[in-house]
């Protein structure tokens, strides 16, 4: 194949691949008709002048995972047809000025996972056709104004995993075609107003894992096409009332792992396309009426691991499409009987690890499609009569780790549990806490004769009009554990970003222990 070097493999399709630690320089002679050249996992430390001079038809050049630390300015001379150049995963600290001169067809430039300390406007001034620039995983501390001014066709820019402490409001101003901007895992503490104003076609903005404390009210007001906004794992303590007002296309918003203390009504929206909202690991203490009312298509709402002690009865107004609601690991002691009334499509509700001491009898009254209810690790002593009777699809109910009071008042619940044992799962069953003579015994098989008369606890409101024993039980005879899929954190859906959080059994969604983390 036109003289394939011995240390390389060459295919009929003009593809050349050279790999191996024994390679210490660009192999020669390379086939003149090569269109794709990959030099991977070698011990090449430098690229000298014009090593690719005779393969001017080259379209794609990957020089990755080498020991490359030095490149001569003329290394890529005569590669006018080159469209894709990757120098990722090397040891480059400095890019020579003019290195990319003459690469008039270059569309993708990957410089990620090196040790670059700085970039300058002159580095990319010749790359007017560039569409993708990957600079993540370097040691960049700042981006000078003008660095990207000539890249007017750029659609994807990744600056994640660097050491950026601030961003100039002018640095992105000429990138009107940019669709993806990633600034995750830097040290940004604030983003100046106007920074993203020129990015009118932006679809994805990744700002997670920085140290951002405040968001300017109009920071995203020009980004009407934004679909994915990642703000998780920052230090955001409050959201300006209008900060998300101009984002009608948004379908992904992550805010978990911040310091949010409160959410004001209408803060989200209108966002008719938002399907998931992740707010776990904040410091939210209460949810006011209508706080999510603009999110008409929301299907997943994760509010776990906050400090929520109060939920206003109308907090979930508007969430008619909600399927999954996670409120576990908060400080809830009471719930209003109407708080879930609007959630007609709710399938899974996660209330474990709270301080609930009782539930209103009508708490699930309008939520007929519930399939999974997590109530373990609360302070429940009994449940109102008939609370689950209408939930014909219920196949998972977790009630363990509550201080069940096994006096005569518990008998209706015990009898219902006897009929519906498969729904409780086999791993852990609820046990009596009081009286002391039955402590530790299974609530399901508790000896009725041992249970003592009701004691001084005030009566829990009950609903006798709802029969405990329907003539024909409407419950499916099923041993299915769960229909849910455990999610521990939203996976940022792009391949070069691995920020999936690992959690233990205090996980953020926690539908079942088997599914967690």
């Amino acid at each position: 194949y036109h003289g394939c070097p011995s240390e390389c493999t060459c295919s009929r399709a003009s593809q050349v691949e050279c790999t191996g630690a024994r390679i210490v320089a660009v192999p020669t002679p390379l086939p003149w008709n090569a269109m794709s050249l990959q030099i991977l996992n070698t011990h090449i430390t430098e690229l000298n002048e014009s090593p690719f001079l005779n393969i001017s038809a080259l379209i794609a050049l990957r020089i990755e995972k080498n020991e490359l630390s030095r490149i001569t300015p003329g290394a890529f001379r005569n590669l006018g047809s080159l469209r894709y150049l990757s120098l990722a995963n090397n040891k480059l600290q400095v890019l020579p000025i003019g290195l990319f001169q003459g690469l008039d067809s270059l569309e993708s430039l990957l410089l990620s996972s090196n040790q670059l300390l700085q970039i300058q406007p002159a580095h990319f001034s010749q790359c007017s056709n560039l569409k993708e620039l990957q600079l993540h995983g370097n040691h960049l501390e700042y981006i000078p104004d003008g660095a990207f001014d000539h890249l007017v066709g750029l659609t994807k820019l990744n600056l994640g995993k660097n050491s950026l402490t601030h961003i100039s409001p002018r640095v992105f101003q000429h990138l009107g075609n940019l669709q993806v901007l990633r600034l995750y895992e830097n040290r940004l503490t604030d983003i100046p107003m106007g920074t993203f104003d020129g990015l009118v076609n932006l679809q994805e903005l990744a700002l997670q894992q920085n140290q951002i404390g405040l968001l300017s009210p109009g920071l995203f007001h020009n980004n009407h096409n934004l679909q994915r906004l990642y703000l998780s794992n920052n230090h955001i303590s409050q959201l300006p009332p209008s900060v998300f007002m101009q984002l009608p296309q948004l379908n992904r918003l992550t805010l978990f792992g911040n310091s949010l203390k409160e959410l004001s009504p209408g803060i989200f929206g209108p966002m008719p396309n938002l399907r998931e909202l992740w707010l776990y690991d904040n410091h939210i203490s209460s949810l006011p009426d209508n706080v999510f009312s603009n999110l008409r298509q929301l299907q997943v709402l994760i509010l776990s691991r906050n400090q929520i002690s109060f939920i206003s009865p109308g907090a979930f107004n508007g969430l008619t499409e909600l399927r999954e609601l996670s409120l576990h690991t908060n400080a809830l002691q009471d719930l209003d009987g109407n708080v879930f009334r609007m959630l007609a499509n709710l399938q899974n509700i996660s209330l474990q690890n709270n301080r609930l001491r009782q539930l209103p009898g009508n708490i699930f009254a309008n939520v007929n499609g519930l399939m999974a209810i997590q109530l373990q690790n609360n302070q429940l002593e009994n449940l109102p009569l008939g609370i689950f009777d209408h939930l014909g699809k219920l196949c998972e109910l977790r009630l363990y780790d509550n201080p069940w009071r096994c006096d005569s008042d518990i008998l209706p619940l015990r009898n219902w549990l006897l009929l519906n044992q498969p729904r409780l799962g086999t791993d852990t069953v609820p046990v009596c806490f009081s009286p002391a003579n039955v402590r530790g015994q299974s609530l399901i098989i508790i000896n009725v004769n041992v249970a003592v008369p009701s004691v001084h606890v005030p009566e829990v409101p009950s609903y006798p009009e709802t029969p405990w024993y329907p003539d024909t039980p409407s419950y499916p005879d099923t041993t299915s554990v769960s229909s849910t899929t455990e999610l521990t954190s939203p996976v940022e859906d792009y391949t070069d970003l691995t920020t999936i959080q690992v959690t233990d059994d205090r996980s953020v969604w926690g539908m079942t222990q088997a599914q967690s983390g």
Epitope: R357, D505, R506
Partner: antibody, heavy 120, light 112 residues
Amino acid sequence: EVQLVESGGGLVQPGGSLRLSCAVSGFSLTSYGVHWVRQATGKGLEWLGVIWAGGSTNYNSALMSRLTISKENAKSSVYLQMNSLRAGDTAMYYCATHMITEDYYGMDYWGQGTTVTVSS
Amino acid sequence: DIVMTQSPDSLAVSLGERATINCKSSQSLLNSRTRHNYLAWYQQKPGQSPKLLIYWASTRESGVPDRFSGSGSGTDFTLTISSLQAEDVAVYYCKQSYNLPTFGGGTKVEIK
């Protein structure tokens, strides 16, 4: 007879970790919760966390990122794992349970404690 | 977190006299539906593990002498030893379990 016996204390380097054990007898861990509480010399009591009969856990929010409580029901043992230790973690560590009390978070049976010293 | 503040830090009382210890919480410990105040008192004698005396603010644990009594509701609570005995020399702690438990700083009771 109900008994709780702590072990695993001793000298630990700053930045290190500890794993304390609480061996229980006279009751089953599938029926009762077990708390961990610590007390620095001459200081007050500090609740660390609890593991309930079903395996759910609650933690002191100030220490949550460094604590893990687990158990092996078959071995009648509860464990406290604590990471990134500092001098302020030097204390007597107790495990306790709610055997008779009507107070769900009450602790009416205690072990004798095991001493942890964090020092270089 | 709920902060529990005990007063006084120490207390010297003659044998047979009344000892009163106060405990204040940073928020109410009363649950309006169960009508319980989620406050407990513990006694710790020198060199010993703590012992539960009183829970739900005023309910004595079984086996606790009736000279120990608890009172109060909401945010203000009191432990009273009506007639101090020599064996009552100890440090007394209040503890809330309305939210995840927190202890007060302790009150040392000595004989005058």
